[in-house]
């Protein structure tokens, strides 16, 4: 799994979306968990409604909410009043029995200030061996990048690399 980076600003809300194949994961509940170290289990933060048909109902655990569009195949997690300690590596999961499939690995970054990420003059351009021709840009408070890639400057875009 590639890691998708979502950036939010401290004190604000951040929405994380995890797309999935609605047919493949039909009837399955979903969960949002946090990886607290290189090893060890992913610690459950919040999961969708116990009744799959009610997965569209928003469930909260503290300042984190989860809701699932089971027809469209999009799991949405909202982190309200984002704080620095919310930063970390998370996973969107699809549950079946005692097993869990990873839908997406998510790196949440919490910025002190929306302008913090890069200075305007600190632009980065792809080198000869790198290409962003197939990058799809969506407007969001978040960004996505492949593992090991250097991010684009703006914090107001969500770059999804196929």
């Amino acid at each position: 799994h590639n890691t998708t980076v979502f950036q939010g600003v401290a004190g604000q809300s951040l929405q994380v979306s995890c797309p999935y194949d609605s047919m493949k994961h039909w009837g399955r509940r979903k969960a949002w968990c946090r990886q607290l170290g290189e090893k060890g289990p992913c610690q459950r933060v919040v999961s969708t409604h116990n009744l799959w048909l009610l997965s569209f109902l928003r469930r909260w655990n503290g300042s984190t909410a989860i809701t699932d569009d089971t027809l469209g195949g999009t799991l949405t997690i909202t982190l309200r009043n984002l704080q620095p300690h919310d930063a970390g590596l998370y996973q969107c999961q699809s549950l079946h029995g005692s097993e869990a499939d990873t839908l997406r690995k998510v790196l949440v970054e919490v910025l002190a200030d929306p302008l913090d990420h890069r200075d305007a003059g600190d632009l980065w351009f792809p080198g000869e061996s790198e290409s962003f021709e197939d990058a799809h840009v969506e407007h969001s408070i978040s960004r996505s990048l492949l593992e090991g890639e250097i991010p684009f400057p703006p914090t107001s875009h969500h770059h999804h690399h196929h």
């Epitope: 980076v5 950036q7 401290a10 990886q35 607290l36 170290g37 290189e38 704080q83 620095p84 300690h85 919310d86 930063a87 970390g88 590596l89 790196l107 970054e109 910025l111 002190a112 913090d116 990420h117 890069r118 990048l145 090991g148 250097i150 991010p151």
Partner: antibody, heavy 121, light 107 residues
Framework: ELQLQESGPVLVKPGASVKMSCKAS????????MNWVKQSHGKSLEWIGV????????SYNQKFKGKATLTVDKSSSTAYMELNSLTSEDSAVYYC??????????????WGQGTLVTVSA | DIQMTQSPSSLSASLGERVSLTCRAS??????LSWLQQKPDGTIKRLIY???TLDSGVPKRFSGSRSGSDYSLTISSLESEDFADYYC?????????FGGGTKLEIK
């Protein structure tokens, strides 16, 4: 063994810039946040800012915005901090301090030995 | 910014004595506090995180506790290597802030 090896002491002239380094070893460099902290002589500690080595994303203490610039070189597992337009107020010991896994949710478990910066004509 | 008011600023104590240092947070920090020890050579070591969790390798004579917005570090029986400077750090919100420090000296 986990180590944060900071660069040696420097004497610089007012108005100049200085770039100090913090070489990490004994762990996966890109998996852990790196913080920078200032300690003026006989004073307490001040948090300057943090960088996520995986993405290069930074957050600064407003007080040090425009003064400090945090960067990393992933290939050498080294974090850098550059201070510009130096004045006597910038004379201090600067520490790098490693955070926790992709975060600072448990504070700063490991600290470098510090770099002494002296600004003098 | 969250102010961390640390007291006392200095403390003289004898070997074997029990001492407590306190940090008061000006805003809610929800236990996101650690205690640091700085030796005379400048070396900094984390002793406690999450207000009361002892770092591995730290002697059990050190303990951390919380009462509302007051956070305490207690050393149950002072040993010679404990004489150093101590700082609290809040990492609940940006900018992270430190207490003013406590200089623990031998009586």
């Amino acid at each position: 063994e986990l180590q944060l090896q900071e660069s040696g002491p420097v004497l610089v002239k007012p108005g100049a810039s200085v770039k100090m380094s913090c070489k990490a070893s004994g762990y996966t460099f890109t998996d852990y946040y790196m913080n920078w902290v200032k300690q003026s002589h006989g004073k307490s500690l001040e948090w300057i800012g943090v960088i996520n080595p995986y993405t290069g994303a930074t957050s600064y203490n407003q007080k040090f915005k425009g003064k400090a610039t945090l960067t990393v070189d992933k290939s050498s597992s080294t974090a850098y901090m550059e201070l510009n337009s130096l004045t006597s107020e910038d004379s201090a010991v600067y520490y790098c301090a490693r955070g926790t896994y992709y975060s600072n949710y448990e504070g700063f478990p490991y600290w470098g030995q510090g770099t002494l910066v002296t600004v003098s004509a | 910014d969250i102010q961390m008011t640390q007291s006392p600023s200095s403390l003289s104590a004898s070997l074997g004595e029990r001492v407590s240092l306190t940090c008061r947070a000006s805003q809610e920090i929800s236990g996101y506090l650690s205690w640091l020890q700085q030796k005379p050579d400048g070396t900094i070591k984390r002793l406690i995180y999450a207000a009361s969790t002892l770092d591995s390798g730290v002697p059990k004579r050190f303990s951390g506790s919380r009462s509302g917005s007051d956070y305490s570090l207690t050393i149950s029986s002072l040993e010679s290597e404990d004489f150093a400077d101590y700082y609290c750090l809040q990492y609940a919100s940006y900018p992270y802030t430190f207490g003013g420090g406590t200089k623990l000296e031998i009586k």
